[in-house]
């Protein structure tokens, strides 16, 4: 019986060419972590396994840092980074637990004037 | 290229004791979690037991709980499944697989061990 | 325990023919589905994982649809090296399960 749930930092903004850090919280279980997925869409960007520690994609090693925690931070900021991010949490017995983030880079000026990202 | 390549089965009586290994090789063994995975003789597959890549999880199927005994050894680059009070419904062909590194299915196989529990 | 049913149980078609298999989990798995390939007296081998994404060297005619309960493998053309015996497989939770696979026969 899955009784866990996964909090998110929900939907984010940031401005284009700085970083960001998506974080996820697993609460309300006894589960054990096995490995946390974070992915885009349907890419891979970084798994952090209980046993391995971390490991960041290839394609992804110049703008992907481990951390703080079990959270990722996104760094050198593009547009086309605006988009779904998903924390997949592997539990045992569980199961799967999946958190999602949206999150939205904005052009430097318009981030300067405040304009925050809202899904009505 | 990736290899699996299981041996130590054979025929024994019920109440028995076997050990299965599995050999890797094609790979960084310690960096993927491994399963033991079973069909027996004209039957669909069912999953035994997992382990991690460094043992910290150990998983196994309820049908063998307390039975079967799954470890690793990194340094020998071998999987290992012992297997006790062995019954007649434990025969089967036993295979090796190692885990995606994503934890999202089996991508490798061994060509599996034949095991065979009977009097 | 999660039970994955298949249907059919097996089928008959020609080389060419577009073929589907259906997997039914017991309770919503989300994208979590495998599929594997399996011919007689060899082991296993993985063509689909997490729903929908091809494993690598695997041929595009294999295809994977469906999430929550309700899974599609689909074989766009036939070829003779396709005969073989199907399962699907659950990966979310543990005990993982399988399906009771779906034998694909030369019609």
């Known amino acids: 019986m899955m009784t866990g749930t996964i909090e998110t930092t929900g939907n984010i903004s940031a401005e284009k060419g700085g970083s960001i850090i998506l974080q996820c919280h697993l609460s309300s279980t006894t589960a054990q972590v096995t490995q946390v997925n974070w992915e885009q869409q349907d890419q891979l960007l970084a798994i952090c396994n209980a046993d391995l520690g971390w490991h960041i994609s290839p394609s992804f090693k110049d703008r992907v840092a481990p951390g703080p925690g079990l959270g990722l931070t996104l760094q050198s900021l593009t547009v086309n980074d605006t988009g779904e991010y998903f924390c997949i949490y592997h539990t045992y017995p569980d199961g799967t637990y999946t958190g999602r983030i949206f999150l939205e880079v904005l052009e430097s000026s318009v981030a300067e004037h405040g304009a925050r990202f809202q899904i009505p | 290229e990736v290899q699996l390549v299981e041996s130590g089965g054979g025929l024994v009586q019920p109440g028995g004791s076997l050990r299965l290994s599995c050999a890797a090789s094609?790979?960084?063994?310690?960096?993927?979690?491994m399963h033991w995975v079973r069909q027996a003789p004209g039957k669909g597959l069912e999953w035994v037991a997992f382990i991690s890549s460094g043992s910290s999880s150990i998983y196994y199927a309820d049908t063998v709980k307390g039975r079967f005994t799954i470890s690793r050894d990194n340094a020998k680059n071998s999987l290992y499944l012992q297997m006790n009070s062995l019954r007649a419904e434990d025969t089967a062909v036993y295979y090796c697989?190692?885990?995606?590194?994503?934890?999202?299915?089996?991508?490798?196989w061994g060509q599996g061990t034949m095991v065979t529990v009977s009097s | 325990d999660i039970q994955m049913t298949q249907s059919p149980s097996s089928l008959s078609a020609s080389v060419g023919d577009r073929v589907t298999i259906t997997c039914r989990a017991s309770k919503s798995i989300s994208k979590y589905l495998a599929w594997y390939q399996q011919k007689p007296g060899k082991a296993p081998k993985l063509l689909i994982y997490s729903g929908s994404t091809l494993q690598s060297g695997v041929p595009s005619r294999f295809s994977g649809s469906g999430s929550g309960t309700d899974f599609t493998l689909t074989i766009s053309s036939l070829q003779p090296e396709d005969f073989a015996t199907y399962y699907c497989?659950?990966?979310?939770?543990?005990?993982?399960?399988f399906g009771g696979g779906t034998k694909v026969e030369i019609k």
């Open positions: 697989a190692r885990m995606r590194l994503d934890y999202y299915a089996m991508d490798y």
């Open positions: 094609g790979f960084t063994f310690s960096n993927f979690g």
């Open positions: 497989q659950q990966h979310n939770e543990y005990p993982w399960t």
